[in-house]
Amino acid sequence: VPLSRTVRCTCISISNQPVNPRSLEKLEIIPASQFCPRVEIIATMKKKGEKRCLNPESKAIKNLLKAVSKERSKRSP
């Protein structure tokens, strides 16, 4: 019988709320792994440095990811 692995994801709660890309200090995308079977997106806000988990399935968050990657591709030569 295989040992049951304890699931230890970082995100206890998630937000579906839209986030203004300008208010972001950092956006971490943690891929699924042996410890956590789901993708986790952690946003660190500029104001107060609050950290929030974002719902990868939310339309608003998908749009945010598109906007952020667009911004990054503009910056890179």
């Epitope: 699931v7 995100c11 206890i12 709660s13 579906n16 789901r38 950290k51 988990c53």
Partner: antibody, heavy 118, light 111 residues
């Protein structure tokens, strides 16, 4: 709003299941906690479960005896308590997670009393 | 024995300023934010301060929180009779199994 139920008087070694009915917020996106308070004592955190039920953390004092679970379709949180001991006697509160990192407790229910006595 | 250390009691006369300390370690207060809860007699705890120094809506600005290193404090300025309650600090602890840790509570008495 959070409303706990299922408390009562139980003998040592027996089991009890507490429920917490949630309303007024999007239950399926918030982690949920159980916290207890023995008569005349301070607050003791018991367990937390993630929004999807996939991640659970327990206090050492209840690990292996208590199980936290949730039913998002019913907007209900549960605490299955097995092998109860006299020291588990307390008011049990459910609480909504703050929503940010790290986890924390936001809104609390009014509590349900569990008495473990022979 | 609570993981976070608070004085068991504090007191003051109406209008005075009362400060409650909360001492922890690098795995809790040192690396995570602190929340404070007020528990009035016979009632459930209520969130008073979150993320070290933020007040939820409806909490008077007489209550303020701060954090430095592995310690935090709650200040009540202009103490009022309705502030007589138990106050608890709490933080997430990054220890191996991860959990929320509380202080033992401080009973505030208005003289």
């Amino acid at each position: 709003q959070l409303v706990e139920s299922g408390g009562g008087v139980v003998q040592p070694g027996r089991s009890l299941r507490l429920s917490c009915a949630a309303s007024g917020f999007t239950f399926s996106t918030y982690g949920m906690h159980w916290v207890r308070q023995a008569p005349g004592k301070g607050l003791e955190w018991v367990a937390v479960i993630s929004y999807d039920g996939g991640t659970k953390y327990y206090a050492d004092s209840v690990k292996g005896r208590f199980t936290i679970s949730r039913d998002n379709s019913m907007k209900t949180l549960y605490l299955q308590m097995n092998s109860l001991r006299t020291e588990d006697t307390a008011v049990y509160y459910c609480a909504k997670d703050l929503g940010d990192l790290p986890p924390g407790l936001d809104y609390w229910g009014q509590g349900t009393m569990v008495t473990v006595s022979s | 024995q609570s993981v976070l250390t608070q004085p068991p009691s504090a007191s003051g006369t109406p209008g005075q300023r009362v400060t409650i300390s909360c001492s922890g370690s690098s795995s809790n207060i040192g690396s995570n934010t602190v929340n404070w809860y007020q528990q009035l007699p016979g009632a459930a705890p209520k969130l008073l301060i979150y993320t070290n120094n933020q007040r939820p809506s409806g909490v008077p600005d007489r209550f303020s929180g701060s954090k430095s290193g592995t310690s935090a404090s709650l200040a009540i300025s202009g103490l009022q009779s309705e502030d007589e309650a138990d106050y608890y600090c709490a933080a997430w602890d990054d220890s191996l199994n991860g959990n929320v840790v509380f202080g033992g509570g401080t009973k505030v008495t208005v003289l």
